[in-house]
């Protein structure tokens, strides 16, 4: 599912509509409609491959399918980074690559994909059902992570197909702010269109004074409140033993399965930073208990046995630490 936020040139409205609503009133609905229809959700894919030459040597490939610019990639094993996983490599597009054993060679393949070769020997070598996770921090989408592992009966030299299994690292601020504004906008748009349809249009005099609309501000929680904003995300059971289903419900909330769009406004750079944040391709949302928005009609992500839901112990803005991410 590669959907990029592309805002096409606005089509001129019908003459009757322009007369009815006026030029100013028209621009907002069209912009909102364009955003509602065209914007998409980024995704991370992970591919794990066992080398035929060295049976315990792995190649992990990860990519980011989104329109934002990547600011950092973290590859971990044994689970997501910061949630029991061990960091294997960190790749910064401008600062270079850092890696730790058993990682042997991490590299950028393209500007949005990376690969990592793991050593096959020693106490820290991976085993066949180890889970590898890739986390992409990007602007403006925020932080996205996906995990993958070899299927239990993989032949050497074969690879698991790329698994687009996005893991939630949602920034509540981004979700509530962006999704909320756009949801409101879509509802408002429908309201305007219905109103136009159901009543005659009075002639509007063009206003001489056009008061400036207040500029949208990107909302960010204070540091003190960040600790409480843990967003659950999913991963696949990791250790070298049979996987078991283990579901935790953060904050005692309900057990729920949904593909949740993550609209993290990552280091919003301007008052109108939300405008360029991707939104789901389908405009219908279903509200979930903790304030996240799940897309209606979308099946739960396909994950293997041992799906675990747990909060990020480092909080929703884990990738926005003071270091490394620029």
């Amino acid at each position: 599912m590669r959907t990029e936020a592309q805002v096409p040139a606005l089509q001129p409205p019908e003459p009757g509509l322009e007369g009815a609503m006026g030029h100013r009133t028209l621009v907002l609905p069209w912009v909102l409609l364009t955003l509602c229809v065209t914007a998409g959700t980024p995704e991370v894919w992970v591919q794990v491959r066992m080398e035929a030459t060295e049976l315990s040597s792995f190649t992990i490939r990860c990519g980011f399918l989104g329109s934002g610019s990547i600011s950092l990639v973290t590859v971990s094993w044994g689970g997501p980074n910061g949630a029991g996983g061990t960091t294997l490599a960190v790749l910064h597009p401008e600062r270079g690559i850092r890696q730790w054993a058993p990682a042997r060679q991490a590299r950028w393949e393209t500007q949005s994909s990376i690969s990592l070769i793991l050593e096959g020997s020693g106490a820290s070598s991976p085993c066949a059902n180890t889970t590898f996770c890739c986390k992409f921090a990007s602007f403006p989408e925020g932080s996205w992570e996906a995990c993958g592992s070899l299927p239990p009966s993989s032949d050497p030299g074969l690879s698991a197909p790329p698994t687009p299994a996005p893991i939630l690292r949602a920034d509540l601020a981004g979700i509530l702010g962006v999704s909320g504004v756009l949801l409101f906008g879509c509802v408002y748009l429908l309201h305007l269109l219905r109103r136009h349809k159901h009543r005659p249009a009075p002639r509007l005099q063009p206003s001489r004074t056009s008061p400036q609309a207040p500029r949208a501000r990107a909302w960010a929680p204070s540091q003190a409140s960040q600790a409480a904003l843990h967003v659950p995300y999913a991963t696949i059971n990791t250790s070298c033993r049979p996987a078991t289903l283990d579901t935790a419900h953060p904050h005692g909330g309900p057990s729920w399965w949904a593909s949740l769009p993550t609209h993290a406004a990552h280091r919003p750079q301007g008052p109108a930073a939300w405008a360029s944040t991707p939104i789901p391709a389908r405009g219908s949302f279903v509200s979930v208990e903790n304030g996240l928005y799940a897309q209606a009609g979308e099946r739960p992500p396909h994950t293997g046995p041992g799906l675990t839901l747990f909060p990020d112990p480092r909080g929703p803005r884990a990738m926005e630490g003071p270091l490394g991410v620029r």
Epitope: G82, T86, T87, L88, H92, P93, E94, R95, G96, I97, R98, W100, A101, P102, R107, W108, E109, T110, Q111, I114, S124, R314, A318, G321, P322, L323, G324
Partner: antibody
Framework: QVQLQQPGAELVKPGTSVKLSCKAS?????SYWINWVKLRPGQGLEW???????????NYNEKFLNKATLTTDTASSTAYMQLNNLASEDSAVYYC???????WGQGTTLIVSA | DIVMTQSPSSLSVSAGEEVIMSCKSS????????????LAWYQQKPGQPPKLLIY???TRESGVPDRFTGSGSGTDFTLTINNVQAEDLAIYYC?????????FGGGTKLEIK
């Protein structure tokens, strides 16, 4: 704000060992790696190695493989570098720096003298 | 190991002048995937730890004045300081950010007349 605290100075005898510390604060210690850098007057900066807290496989500059041992204690958010079999050429200022050398400690001056 | 060579080893200029210092690497610092050159510059003032000035050859770290400009690619890089100020008195190091071990140049000492 981000801080890396290092002791100001250590005076040790040749042939002994010393364990230098670097206490991190102001960020999540397990989110970024710690580098160690040596500075000798007139000789410039030398990268000794780096360690990611929680990953027990540090990287070393080969030149320091038998000299330095890097460890971390996540409970106290502290990184350590042990230098063994000290000699006069080990006298230098040793810095710790986090991540991509974004933040640096003030450095520990190590004096190896009989 | 990648060897980083800086020149000149020291230079003395008057305030307001322009300074250009060079850094050469024994191997290319270009990353083929990102098409970025992984070279960083640091400033070390007397009695202080080094401070990151520029990374990725030309990207200024936040808070660094735009008087400091990095350029170059492959194996040849330069740091230019326009309108030198008294507070720029320091040793400037270039660093291979490309591959282990992360080697530094010998430094260029900038003195103000």
């Amino acid at each position: 704000q981000v801080q890396l605290q290092q002791p100001g100075a250590e005076l040790v005898k040749p042939g002994t060992s010393v364990k230098l510390s670097c206490k991190a604060s102001g960020y999540n210690f397990t989110s970024y790696w710690i580098n160690w850098v040596k500075l000798r007057p007139g000789q410039g900066l030398e990268w000794i190695g780096d360690i990611y807290p929680g990953n027990y496989s540090p990287n070393y500059n080969e030149k320091f493989l038998n000299k330095a041992t890097l460890t971390t204690d996540t409970a106290s958010s502290t990184a350590y570098m042990q230098l063994n079999n000290l000699a006069s050429e080990d006298s230098a200022v040793y810095y710790c720096a986090s991540g991509y050398f974004d933040y640096w400690g003030q450095g520990t001056t190590l004096i190896v003298s009989a | 190991d990648i060897v980083m060579t800086q020149s000149p080893s020291s230079l003395s200029v008057s305030a307001g002048e322009e300074v250009i210092m060079s850094c050469k690497s024994s191997q290319s610092l270009l990353n083929s995937g990102t098409q970025k050159n992984y070279l960083a510059w640091y400033q070390q003032k007397p009695g202080q730890p080094p401070k990151l000035l520029i990374y990725g050859t030309s990207t200024r770290e936040s808070g660094v004045p735009d008087r400091f400009t990095g350029s170059g690619s492959g194996t040849d890089f330069t740091l230019t300081i326009n309108n030198v100020q008294a507070e720029d008195l320091a040793i400037y190091y270039c660093q291979n950010d490309h591959s282990y071990p992360y080697t530094f140049g010998g430094g260029t000492k900038l003195e103000i007349k």
